[in-house]
């Protein structure tokens, strides 16, 4: 058959010191008068005992029933419950995306940049020893790299054979930031991302 909720508030004395009994499904709750606390309103309320301040905030009693939380840097709210979003003032460089931290922020960097603020250039020539093929020389540049091809070879990575005999011209390719974004960042090649 159907279960009927017992109204615990029908039984007097659950809530002490003038507390109001509130019936809940399968339970009840006491709403205490100012100055009392606890499940049955049976304890005296002391503002900072225990401290309601979280995230390392320090409690200061400001009156008989009032308190103030002095929050650590990076937190706000009456009990320091909110982590302040540091991203509105972020300075992530070179296409970095801001990730909020505690009283700071970090930057998720595109593959060719690293460091907390994406200000450090990744040396693609170290990262990819075979970036330039067929004896080509890899030259690291800010935000990318270039290949200097030996005679007879051409192309982005010196993989194209020059058939027309115009081998006196070395082909230099410089990877631009926008090409990196299109070729790597938006195609899910996130293995070079630096998370802090």
């Amino acid at each position: 058959g159907s279960e009927t909720d017992v109204n615990e508030c029908d039984i007097p004395g659950h809530c002490q010191h003038g507390g109001t009994c509130l019936n809940l499904p399968g339970s009840y709750q006491c709403q205490c008068l100012q100055g009392f606390t606890g499940q049955y309103c049976d304890s005296l309320y002391v503002p900072c005992a225990p401290s309601p301040c979280v995230n390392g905030g320090t409690c200061r009693q400001t009156g008989d029933f009032t308190f103030e939380c002095n929050c650590l840097p990076g937190f706000e709210g009456s009990t320091c419950e909110r982590n302040i979003d540091d991203c509105p003032n972020h300075r992530c460089q070179n296409g970095g995306v801001c990730v909020d931290g505690v009283n700071t922020y970090n930057c998720r960097c595109p593959p060719q940049w690293t460091g907390q603020f994406c200000t450090e250039d990744v040396d693609e020539c170290l990262l990819q020893p075979n970036a330039c093929q067929n004896g080509g020389t890899c030259a690291n540049r800010n935000g990318g790299y270039g290949c200097v091809c030996v005679n007879g070879w051409s192309g982005d990575d010196c993989s194209e054979n020059i058939d027309d005999g115009n081998s006196g011209l070395n082909d230099i390719f410089e990877a631009q930031k926008i090409e990196w974004h299109e070729n790597l960042y938006f195609q899910g090649h996130h293995h070079h991302h630096h998370h802090h």
Partner: antibody, heavy 120, light 107 residues
Framework: EVQLVESGGGLVQPGGSLKLSCAVS????????MEWVRQASGKGLEWVAA??????????VYSASVKDRFTISRDDSKSTLYLQMNSLKTEDTAVYYC???????????WGQGTLVTVSS | DIQMTQSPSSVSASVGDRVTITCQTS??????LAWYQQKPGKSPKLLIY???RLQDGVPSRFSGSGSGTDYTLTISSLQPEDFATYYC?????????FGGGTKVEIK
């Protein structure tokens, strides 16, 4: 060669408006944060406003002293940064510099500056 | 806002002297500090970024150091062209803030 050239400064009465321009060349404009910094005569440098780059949706930040009065914007097709200044006050009198944020948390290129004088 | 305390406000020195300028920030700026040189009637010029990195074309007599909240600019051997005003600037977060400046004068 990276170049920034400001224009649009001049004499304006308190409460008036002025629009500064900064024409840039020698770099891909949309890749960089751009800043306006000002300097009153004989005083130090004061940051005014910034517009982030394309990767950061060209989002904008202002100093408290100019918020709701000044507007920073850019026209990528003209490679030009702007600063629309409204409700000008005498304390806005300064040389206004346009600068590029070079991707190193520092302003690596500056214009020659344009003088704004707010006086009745 | 991050407060920048630059000292001294002025210094008198002779050619060949070693000059040190300090900058203290009100909170950790994670080495996001730059130093600029400005001469009368001219635009500021970037000398140092990232607290210690020398900008291209800047003479090696200029050096920067520091971390956290304390930073230093050193001119190892002052040259005639170095007499100018120097500013520190934090680039960690907006609003960007500058030190009050240090005027390096001829003794």
């Amino acid at each position: 060669e990276v170049q920034l050239v400001e224009s649009g400064g001049g004499l304006v009465q308190p409460g008036g408006s002025l629009k500064l321009s900064c024409a840039v060349s020698g770099f891909t404009f949309s890749d960089f944060y751009m800043e306006w910094v000002r300097q009153a005569s004989g005083k130090g440098l004061e940051w005014v406003a910034a517009q982030r780059n394309k990767a950061n949706d060209f989002s904008i930040v202002y100093s408290a002293s100019v918020k709701d009065r000044f507007t920073i914007s850019r026209d990528d097709s003209k490679s030009t940064l702007y600063l629309q200044m409204n409700s000008l006050k005498t304390e806005d009198t300064a040389v206004y510099y346009c600068s590029r944020d070079g991707g190193r948390l520092a302003l690596d290129a500056w214009g020659q500056g344009t003088l704004v004088t707010v006086s009745s | 806002d991050i407060q920048m305390t630059q000292s001294p406000s002025s210094v008198s020195a002779s050619v060949g002297d070693r000059v040190t300028i300090t900058c203290q920030t009100s909170e950790d700026i994670y080495s996001g500090l730059a130093w600029y040189q400005q001469k009368p009637g001219k635009s500021p010029k970037l000398l140092i970024y990232g607290a210690s990195r020398l900008q291209d074309g800047v003479p090696s007599r200029f050096s920067g150091s520091g971390s956290g909240t304390d930073y230093t600019l050193t001119i190892s051997s002052l040259q005639p062209e170095d007499f100018a005003t120097y500013y520190c600037q934090q680039g960690f977060k907006y609003p960007l803030t500058f030190g009050g400046g240090t005027k390096v004068e001829i003794k």
